[in-house]
Interface confidence: medium
Amino acid sequence: GSERTCCPVNWVEHERSCYWFSRSGKAWADADNYCRLEDAHLVVVTSWEEQKFVQRHIGPVNTWMGLHDQNGPWKWVDGTDYETGFKNWRPEQPDDWYGHGLGGGEDCAHFTDDGRWNDDVCQRPYRWVCETELDKASQEPPLL
């Protein structure tokens, strides 16, 4: 596929990545799917600098990121290694809490009002952030 060299309209460029910030809410799986359809993925936070950038744009609003443990261990949607990577959990989180009675535990991560991370029930309709890397091959077939 062809390489993406600039960000799509309404996306924000930062450090060779493009970010799109939703203003509505979706369940985590629907947000994940939305980003995939845009040839992107839910945001993967790899540094404190990226954390602060995203935080500035989302404000004090619960917002999904591309981190989940629906299949057991915590995983980033783009394959970035969780164990060795950047983390910014709230104290005592993630806790996979079951006491809410909503069925299952808490398998999806989101930015909380102060930017730190919490795990929550994946059905919550939170805002979300899509990310795609510049210079990566897009999934679109090349123009002939």
């Epitope: 809490w97 809410h100 009002d113 309709p125």
Partner: antibody
């Protein structure tokens, strides 16, 4: 047993301030979000504000935003509601209630309420 | 904001009756719904959370059902102590909002 006891209510003139307190006992206060809910005379329940378990996040009903401030002191197991610029329509019984979790899982335990009357 | 509409606003029933109260949300709230009972001069008491989960200590004659926008609280056999006002409340997002209440009176 789990108990919430509100205090600080009374009669106050419009435009003045009042601070309500809610003393918690029988559970680990610092692990739970806390809410204030009010009920005007003869009316239904109205959610007022929430504060997360660690005090980091607060949310308010539009009707009180900018006038009321929710806070907590986990070392004293106490929740507060600072009410400024009071109006006649703030007259109500004010209940504190415990969240089922950190702050967004609904209410389970309620206090007995304290009455606030705003009148000149 | 999400609006919660309860019906009926009041009803008369006899001891032993099966009573059903409905609550409708203005948008889908999954099962983020609670039911409360309030008696005159008393604080509300939690009955049901997550639409259908019974609060600890609440008798099984109370049951809740529904998901999305339409919810029901059922009292299988009304007893004298059940005459009260019942409220639904969503907790999907802030602000949390209550229904207007349903007063259950003795026929």
């Amino acid at each position: 047993q789990v108990q919430l006891v509100e205090s600080g209510g009374g009669v106050v003139q419009p435009g003045r301030s009042l601070r309500l307190s809610c003393a918690a006992s029988g559970f680990t206060f610092s692990s739970y979000g806390m809410h204030w809910v009010r009920q005007a005379p003869g009316k239904g329940l109205e959610w007022v504000a929430v504060i997360w378990y660690d005090g980091s996040n607060e949310h308010y009903a539009d009707s009180v935003k900018g006038r009321f401030t929710i806070s907590r002191d986990n070392s004293k197991n106490t929740l507060y509601l600072q009410m400024n610029s009071l109006r006649a329509e703030d007259t109500a019984v004010y209940y504190c209630a415990r969240d089922r979790g950190v702050g967004y899982y609904g209410l389970d335990v309620w206090g007995q309420g304290t009455t606030v009357t705003v009148s000149s | 904001d999400i609006q919660m509409t309860q019906s009926p606003s009041s009803l008369s029933a006899s001891v032993g009756d099966r009573v059903t109260i409905t609550c409708r949300a203005s948008q889908g709230i999954s099962n983020y719904l609670a039911w409360f009972q309030q008696k005159p001069g008393k604080a509300p008491k939690s009955l049901i959370y997550a639409a259908s989960s019974l609060q600890s200590g609440v008798p099984s004659k109370f049951s809740g059902s529904g998901s999305g926008t339409d919810f029901t609280l059922t009292i299988s056999s009304l007893q004298p102590e059940d005459f009260a006002t019942y409220y639904c409340q969503h907790y999907l997002t802030y602000p949390l909002t209550f229904g207007g209440g349903t007063k259950v009176e003795i026929k």
